[in-house]
Amino acid sequence: MNGSEYFVKIQSFLGGAPTEDLKALSQQNVSMDLATFMKLRTDAVLPLTVAEVQKLLGPHVEGLKAEERHRPVRDWILRQRQDDLDTLGLGLQGGIPNGYLVLDLSMQEALSGTPCLLGP
């Protein structure tokens, strides 16, 4: 069974998948479609790296540009380094600028909805 066939079989169970499962899935060459990706739990998507999302979505990663104003895509973009976003070749903006550190202050983020940044 190839990755695409595997994805079709598990698609209906993915809604509540935790980050760890999504990271594992990104190694399976599943090419998740964007509609399914956007139904995932936001808290499960946010920790994924650009490389992991790229592997998870495969060719459908191109659609992030078309859906950049919608959650969880918008929130995920805000969490990524701009340099990493640039590798997607989509002109996505809003990532963390080069030279900034991301502080994992859970309370701060819970209140504001965005990560706390420490400038250069």
Partner: antibody, heavy 117, light 113 residues
Framework: EVQLVQSGAEVKKPGASVKVSCKAS????????MHWVRQAPGQGLEWMGN????????YYNERFMSRVTMTVDKSTSTVYMELSSLRSEDTAVYYC??????????WGQGTLVTVSS | DIVMTQSPDSLAVSLGERATINCKSS????????????LAWYQQKPGQSPKLLIY???TRESGVPDRFSGSGSGTDFTLTISSLQAEDVAVYYC?????????FGGGTKVEIK
């Protein structure tokens, strides 16, 4: 103004390979994916695959998986599509098309590839 | 693969009259989160490259005359030319960009009656 200029028509023998180029201008080349679509004479459109011009990552329609290779040259803002093991049914016009998000917003003029012995 | 079925194959309409083209997909093209339908319409005039008319099923590409409109959701979509002009003679294709391989309908040829 966005422009996609493709290489000229080619005549190839069965079993040979063809490499079609698509030179882009008028926009930031690395910000938009490129797709390849072909159209056999008098027929409809068939998606072959797409390529990320920033990283060079490419994805192919499984129908062409073993025969197609898409590459990019960022220095010249050019994308290439090579199709190998040509057969008569590969005779078609091959188009490059720049993505607009997912849809194909701008198309090249097309390159006619004729496969004939 | 998602199968796109267009109807009719060809259509002859008088100048100034309405032309309606249908497109049906074998599975939903709706993103239920964003409410976007991943469907585009293209126009291909004789001897020319295809040209984008509509994306997200109903969003008109800039520069496209407002006599062209798209509608529908899920699996059933329609392209309407409200008042056919001579320059609208072409083949029209729908395309799904929901899941690869992105697939096109077989095309609808629009002619003047």
């Amino acid at each position: 103004e966005v422009q996609l200029v493709q290489s000229g028509a080619e005549v190839k023998k069965p079993g040979a390979s063809v490499k079609v180029s698509c030179k882009a201008s008028g926009y930031t080349f690395t910000n938009y994916w490129m797709h390849w679509v072909r159209q056999a004479p008098g027929q409809g459109l068939e998606w072959m695959g797409n390529i990320n011009p920033s990283s060079g990552d490419s994805y192919y329609n499984e129908r062409f998986m073993s025969r197609v290779t898409m590459t990019v040259d960022k220095s010249t803002s050019t994308v290439y599509m090579e199709l190998s093991s040509l057969r008569s049914e590969d005779t078609a016009v091959y188009y490059c098309a720049r993505s607009g998000g997912l849809w194909l917003a701008f198309w090249g003029q097309g390159t006619l590839v004729t496969v004939s012995s | 693969d998602i199968v796109m079925t267009q109807s009719p194959d060809s259509l002859a309409v008088s100048l100034g009259e309405r032309a309606t083209i249908n497109c049906k997909s074998s599975q939903t093209l709706l993103n239920s989160v964003s409410q976007n339908n991943y469907l585009a319409w293209y126009q291909q005039k004789p001897g020319q490259s295809p040209k984008l008319l509509i994306y997200f099923a109903s969003t008109r590409e800039s520069g496209v005359p407002d006599r062209f409109s798209g509608s529908g959701s899920g699996t059933d979509f329609t392209l309407t030319i409200s008042s056919l002009q001579a320059e609208d003679v072409a083949v029209y294709y729908c395309q799904q960009h929901y899941r690869t391989p992105y697939t096109f309908g077989g095309g609808t040829k629009v002619e003047i009656k």
